[in-house]
Interface confidence: low
């Protein structure tokens, strides 16, 4: 069962799945100036049996016609449903997360893929939140959100995470302060983007720290 909406947004935080549940779909998106090959897949699908999960289909991008090079590829109707995006991630994941039964690792990159990946999550998917660079957590350890089914409807649990500016102790989460945003966009528009390097460093650090152990009893 696909989750109806996106994981919740947290001011000055990003989310990331460490592994993807079977049934998760990843749109085959191409970078500007490229498009999916006509016979190519619309999406990759995490499938598997009791012992092994992997991504079905392979995304393929080809150069667009010259006249279309400045145009973004128009999504197909079945892709129009808006999903949260994360910047392209490295397939390297912590072993204990990626080898979960019934889960797929981060799919490897494909040639000329878009810089953002659009996932369609399924019930049971867990995503982890961390504060963006320049902000620190006021809660201990990573916070998580799980897509749950209740009364026939899907919902994401609320992650217990507050991020506050490191550089300025009076700075409170969400309070605006002048700072450079990627591509000059406002903070609020970029808060869901994860840069691979930052996230990997944070994840690796968290994995070695006692404070990375969190409880789910509170949800």
């Amino acid at each position: 069962e696909l989750c109806d909406d996106d994981p919740p947004e947290i001011p000055h935080a990003t989310f990331k799945a460490m592994a993807y549940k079977e049934g998760t779909m990843l749109n085959c998106e191409c970078k500007r100036g490229f498009r999916r090959i006509k016979s190519g897949s619309l999406y990759m699908l995490c499938t598997g049996n009791s012992s092994h999960s992997s991504w079905d289909n392979q995304c393929q991008c080809t150069s667009s016609a010259t006249r279309n090079t400045t145009k973004q590829v128009t999504p197909q109707p079945e892709e129009q449903k808006e999903r949260k995006t994360t910047e392209m991630q490295s397939p390297m994941q912590p072993v204990d997360q990626a080898s979960l039964p019934g889960h797929c690792r981060e799919p490897p990159p494909w040639e000329n893929e878009a810089t953002e990946r659009i996932y369609h999550f399924v019930v049971g998917q867990m995503v982890y939140y961390q504060c963006v660079q320049g902000y620190r957590a006021l809660h201990r350890g990573p916070a998580e959100s799980v897509c749950k089914m209740t009364h026939g409807k899907t919902r994401w649990t609320q992650p217990q995470l507050i991020c506050t500016g490191e550089m300025e102790t009076s700075q409170f989460p969400g309070e605006e302060k002048p700072q450079a945003s990627p591509e000059g966009r406002p903070e609020s528009e970029t808060s869901c983007l994860v840069t691979t390097t930052d996230f990997q460093i944070q994840t690796e650090m968290a994995a070695t720290m006692e404070t990375s152990i969190f409880t789910t009893e509170y949800q």
Epitope: P8, E9, H139, R140, Q160, I162, T169, G174
Partner: antibody
Framework: QVQLVESGGGVVQPGRSLRLSCAAS????????MAWVRQAPGKGLEWVAY????????YYADSVKGRFTISRDNSKNTLYLQMNSLRAEDTAVYYC?????????WGQGTLVTVSS | DIQMTQSPSSLSASVGDRVTITCRAS??????LNWYQQKPGKAPRRLIY???SLQSGVPSRFSGSGSGTDYTLTISSLQPEDFATYYC?????????FGQGTKLEIK
């Protein structure tokens, strides 16, 4: 079952002090930020103070800055609000809350009356 | 501080009615908005977080929507237990602020 129980409220004269406590149970207190929210009789809600899980970061509403101090003792699973130089306008029910900015769980509240 | 203004301040309705309460922020709150229900003598109870996510255990007749500065809480079919005061609250910027409340009364 998350439980937050406030205590320490009562009647106090203007200019005097009072300390509120909030005993927490049913969740890992030391992992969560906490806050105090107040509600004057017949009025709306106001966030008063906020403290990070480790007590390193505290934030206050302008109306209480310099007079109120929020603190916590993670070994006792207890949140505190030290209120000094109390004013009539501080009269309210004070709620202890957790769940960060979303006020996920609340105590039943304790009434503070500042009156001469 | 961000000011939150709710309308109407009070509202009379009947069981079964569809009710809408609106909340306007003095600046963009980026969908970082919660809705609470409060009954006399009780602590507030969170109904909706992040504009439209239903709190666990809250009936599906409650729903939230909006973006930017304008937000809405809708109760699709009023039940007797829904008569209470409702508050919106932003958490994009400290101090987090509440609306002044909307009192929902039985007609």
């Amino acid at each position: 079952q998350v439980q937050l129980v406030e205590s320490g409220g009562g009647v106090v004269q203007p200019g005097r002090s009072l300390r509120l406590s909030c005993a927490a149970s049913g969740f890992t207190f030391s992992s969560h930020a906490m806050a105090w929210v107040r509600q004057a009789p017949g009025k709306g809600l106001e966030w008063v103070a906020y403290i990070s899980y480790d007590g390193d970061n505290t934030y206050y509403a302008d109306s209480v800055k310099g007079r109120f101090t929020i603190s916590r003792d993670n070994s006792k699973n207890t949140l505190y609000l030290q209120m000094n130089s109390l004013r009539a306008e501080d009269t309210a029910v004070y709620y202890c809350t957790t769940g960060g900015n979303s006020g996920y769980d609340w105590g039943q509240g304790t009434l503070v009356t500042v009156s001469s | 501080d961000i000011q939150m203004t709710q309308s109407p301040s009070s509202l009379s309705a009947s069981v079964g009615d569809r009710v809408t309460i609106t909340c306007r922020a003095s600046q963009n709150v980026n969908k970082f908005l919660n809705w609470y229900q409060q009954k006399p003598g009780k602590a507030p109870r969170r109904l909706i977080y992040g504009t439209n996510s239903l709190q666990s255990g809250v009936p599906s007749r409650f729903s939230g929507s909006g973006s930017g500065t304008d937000y809405t809480l809708t109760i699709s079919s009023l039940q007797p237990e829904d008569f209470a005061t409702y508050y919106c609250q932003q958490y994009t910027s400290w101090p987090w602020t509440f609306g002044q409340g909307t009192k929902l009364e039985i007609k």
